[in-house]
Amino acid sequence: LTCLGGFASPGPVPPSTALRELIEELVNITQNQKAPLCNGSMVWSINLTAGMYCAALESLINVSGCSAIEKTQRMLSGFCPHKVSAGQFSSLHVRDTKIEVAQFVKDLLLHLKKLFREGQFN
């Protein structure tokens, strides 16, 4: 992960490290998971498109009382241009499948890593 920083664009907030820090946090969550993450809470699955940051935040913000993902929730807010509140879903949110938070985090992490490999970050 240490070599990911060069892919992110320097400049405005969040800084170039923000994306790397998000990935590192997702790695920490997946690696340090002992008991079921967030007591096995279920969240809505999302479409992993360029707008996925807002969708991911919309989904995860509905998990309360889970300190393990609070930092991820805060970080994602820096990637979403819109205000996201618990119980709110954009009209584009695909709400047909619920998955465990642990799987959600794993899917998001794998997708972000895949995007780095494809060079999709400026």
């Epitope: 405005p12 360029a50 707008g51 820096g78 241009p81 819109h82 009209s91 584009l92 060079g119």
Partner: antibody, heavy 118, light 109 residues
């Protein structure tokens, strides 16, 4: 009904400044990211800038970086574009655009024309 | 920076005909591609998002397809109001940089 009304356009000399405004209504302005998109006469669309719902983050196209500043006043439901060091190539219709969820541009204003000419 | 190329630049067709517009990205944009329609003197209007999803109010005759680098907008049977300029558009994952194609003008033959 969502309404976005741009103002502040006009004729300006190269090197001078201009500030565009966009009055928003029909939605909770303070909840949404907003953009400026421009279109030179007879040309295609060019994204200019985005600002987060709370003004915390701003991003710009390379062509305007360092010269243009996007800002907002949520208490007035107004979006701004401060344009400095204007060039002839900045001549365009400037659109104020609302974002939403996965769609960056779901509602557009009718635009205001900026002409940079000596 | 991802560059979008649209073809043809101009498509001359008649009402009732099928129209196929192409958009090619210089590198993969996954399925994140949108199509906008613009009529003279008007602001653009969203038609399709995420390559194939119709936006609210988009008639069923409009459909989008493709993924990766090659995308298509199809108008199954042209109506008089469909003669306009069509732009494809993509958003980079991070930072949020937005790019439009040069446009395809659909005019009456």
């Amino acid at each position: 009904e969502v309404q976005l009304v741009e103002s502040g356009g006009g004729v300006v000399q190269p090197g001078r400044s201009l500030r565009l405004s966009c009055a928003a209504s029909g939605f909770t302005f303070s909840n949404y990211g907003m953009h400026w998109v421009r279109q030179a006469p007879g040309k295609g669309l060019e994204w200019v800038a985005i600002i987060w719902y709370d003004g915390s983050n701003k991003y710009y196209a390379d062509s305007v970086k360092g010269r243009f500043t996007i800002s907002r006043d949520n208490s007035k439901n107004t979006l701004y574009l401060q344009m400095n060091s204007l060039r002839a190539e900045d001549t365009a219709v400037y659109y104020c655009v609302k974002g939403s969820g996965d769609i960056p541009f779901d509602y557009w204003g009718q635009g205001t024309l900026v002409t940079v000419s000596s | 920076e991802i560059v979008l190329t649209q073809s043809p630049a101009t498509l001359s067709s008649s009402p009732g005909e099928r129209a196929t517009l192409s958009c090619r990205a210089s590198q993969s944009v996954s399925s994140y591609l949108a199509w906008y329609q613009q009529k003279p003197g008007q602001a653009p209007r969203l038609l399709i998002y995420d390559a194939s999803n119709r936006a609210t109010g988009t008639p069923a005759r409009f459909s989008g397809s493709g993924s990766g680098t090659d995308f298509t907008l199809t108008i199954s049977s042209l109506e008089p109001e469909d003669f306009a300029v069509y732009y494809c558009h993509q958003r980079s994952h991070w930072p949020p940089i937005f790019t439009f194609g040069p446009g395809t003008k659909v005019d009456i033959k």
